[in-house]
């Protein structure tokens, strides 16, 4: 998630939007102005061509992997489970984000030559990818919780409801990403290449922080708590009942959630620390500011990498994904039908035991 950084932060930020031009210098000056040591912003120094190569690799892997995932799910119309629909949307979100990577890569070399419209759009897609991802995973956790803990399918098996939930997730993701759409723009300067970044203008610090705290809490913390609750009870039920088959069915989902958390939790924790520092819950110092900037750079790459990882999980852990892919290849005559496993069907869904299905 961006970079959800309300970053056009002049020292007015520290003064909660007061006009420093009227500040009385007869009173005690703020310590950062008295400190002879300069506070020079720092971030990780990484060769721009290395960044371009990373973007290119993630783009290619994500494009190929997520396209295949969508293809396999769309081919398996008959046995498609609710979780498959959520995973289809997850792949779509990753794919949309991956399509913006060549633009980010080009901007790394030439500066932002694409104007404000594309600046807003590609930034929005990055945010939407993150929010839709975590919200979809939260929905999967609720679906698995209802199916395994409460042994109910009545809610989630209604196709129109699932479609409505997915549309709501996309809508909510757009809403949560709205600050980026509002404040991101191309900034031109005589000294540097054009840049696409968050320019908050003269908005007060309170307004700035509200726009950061709301998406962070509703878009990350709340879904995270839902997942912890649902998967906690789901795991407990599986272990108590010794449901081996169902436990195996959950492997892919757990792997997807784990990878998501490993990729996005570090970045969001740093972002949370940044927010706490800006709201002066944690005292801001030059050293802390720079530590956070370096940490944002170090952890953001994990979030970018995430967009190409889910297909790899399905390929290595999801037996049904492999079978479904082989089936499609066989249908199109790309491989021999004899090489297909006996139980292979063009579906992500395996055997349905009780009220749950072995997804992927």
């Amino acid at each position: 998630m961006e970079d959800f950084n309300m970053e056009s932060d002049s020292f007015e930020d520290f003064w909660k939007g007061e006009d420093l031009s009227n500040y009385s210098y007869s009173s005690t000056l703020p310590p950062f102005l008295l400190d002879a040591a300069p506070c020079e912003p720092e971030s990780l120094e990484i060769n721009k061509y290395f960044v371009v190569i990373i973007y290119a690799l993630v783009f290619l892997l994500s494009l190929l992997g997520n396209s295949l995932v969508m293809l396999v799910i769309l081919y398996s119309r008959v046995g498609r489970s609710v979780t498959d629909v959520y995973l289809l949307n997850l792949a779509l979100a990753d794919l949309l984000f991956a399509l913006t990577l060549p633009i980010w890569a080009a901007s790394k070399v030439n500066g932002w030559i694409f104007g404000t419209f594309l600046c807003k759009v590609v930034s929005l897609l990055k945010e939407v990818n993150f929010y839709s991802g975590i919200l979809l995973l939260a929905c999967i956790s609720v679906d698995r919780y209802l199916a395994i803990v409460h042994a109910t399918r009545t809610l989630t098996q209604k196709r129109y409801l699932v479609k409505f939930i997915c549309l709501s997730i996309w809508g909510l993701s757009l809403l949560l990403a709205l600050p980026v759409l509002l404040f991101r723009r191309t900034v031109y300067s005589s000294n540097v290449s054009p840049a696409c970044y968050e320019d908050m203008g003269n908005n007060t610090a309170n307004w700035r922080m509200l726009l950061r705290i709301l998406p962070q809490s509703f878009g990350f913390i709340v879904p995270l708590l839902i997942m912890l609750f649902c998967y906690g009870f789901t795991l407990r039920t599986l272990f108590k009942a010794h449901m081996g088959q169902k436990h195996r069915a959950m492997r892919v989902i757990f792997a997807v959630v784990l990878i998501f958390l490993l990729c996005w939790l570090p970045y969001n924790l740093v972002l949370l620390a940044d927010t706490l520092m800006r709201t002066q819950v944690i005292q801001e110092t030059c050293e802390r500011r720079n530590h956070i900037d370096r940490a944002l750079d170090a952890t953001e790459i994990l979030g970018i990498l995430h967009s190409c990882l889910n297909p790899l999980i399905y390929a290595f852990i999801g037996q049904k994904f492999r079978h479904g892919l082989l089936k499609i290849l066989a249908i199109h005559g790309l491989i021999s039908k004899d090489s297909l496993p006996k139980d292979s069907r063009p579906s992500f869904v395996g055997s349905s035991s009780g009220h749950t299905s072995t997804t992927l």
Partner: nanobody
Framework: EVQLVESGGGLVQPGGSLRLSCVAS????????MGWYRQTPGKQRELVAD???????NYIDAVKGRFTISRDNTKNTVYLQMNSLKPEDTAVYYC????????????????????WGQGTQVTVSS
């Protein structure tokens, strides 16, 4: 890398004039406030005058009516015209600027830094 370079300091007689210049260079997105500070041996650095990007100016009482701060935004330069200099104006004069720069490897973020020049000596003596 942002740098502030001062010039114009030197030895002057009481009642004389000097014009200090400070130019900011490097990957600068925007300069918010530029100012002049001074420091005498054993004392804390004090603000002399500063000017915002919008043209708002502040002076300390000791220099009002004698010193004039101005800036050229197109050249990222701030000037301090010092007239009717007094021996108590003797100090090392430092240029300070609140500069917005871009940081970030993957996504660019604007950050405001507090930058200082290396200082220029002003000596008022007969």
């Amino acid at each position: 890398e942002v740098q502030l370079v001062e010039s114009g300091g030197g030895l002057v007689q009481p009642g004389g004039s000097l014009r200090l210049s400070c130019v900011a260079s490097g990957s600068i997105v925007r300069i918010n406030t530029m100012g002049w500070y001074r420091q005498t041996p054993g004392k804390q650095r004090e603000l002399v005058a500063d000017i915002t990007s919008g043209g708002n100016i502040n002076y300390i009482d000791a220099v009002k009516g004698r010193f004039t701060i101005s800036r050229d935004n197109t050249k990222n330069t701030v000037y301090l015209q010092m007239n009717s200099l007094k021996p108590e104006d003797t100090a090392v004069y430092y240029c300070n600027a609140e500069i917005v720069v871009l940081v970030g490897v993957w996504t660019q973020r604007a950050r405001t830094g507090n930058y200082w020049g290396q200082g220029t000596q002003v000596t008022v003596s007969s």
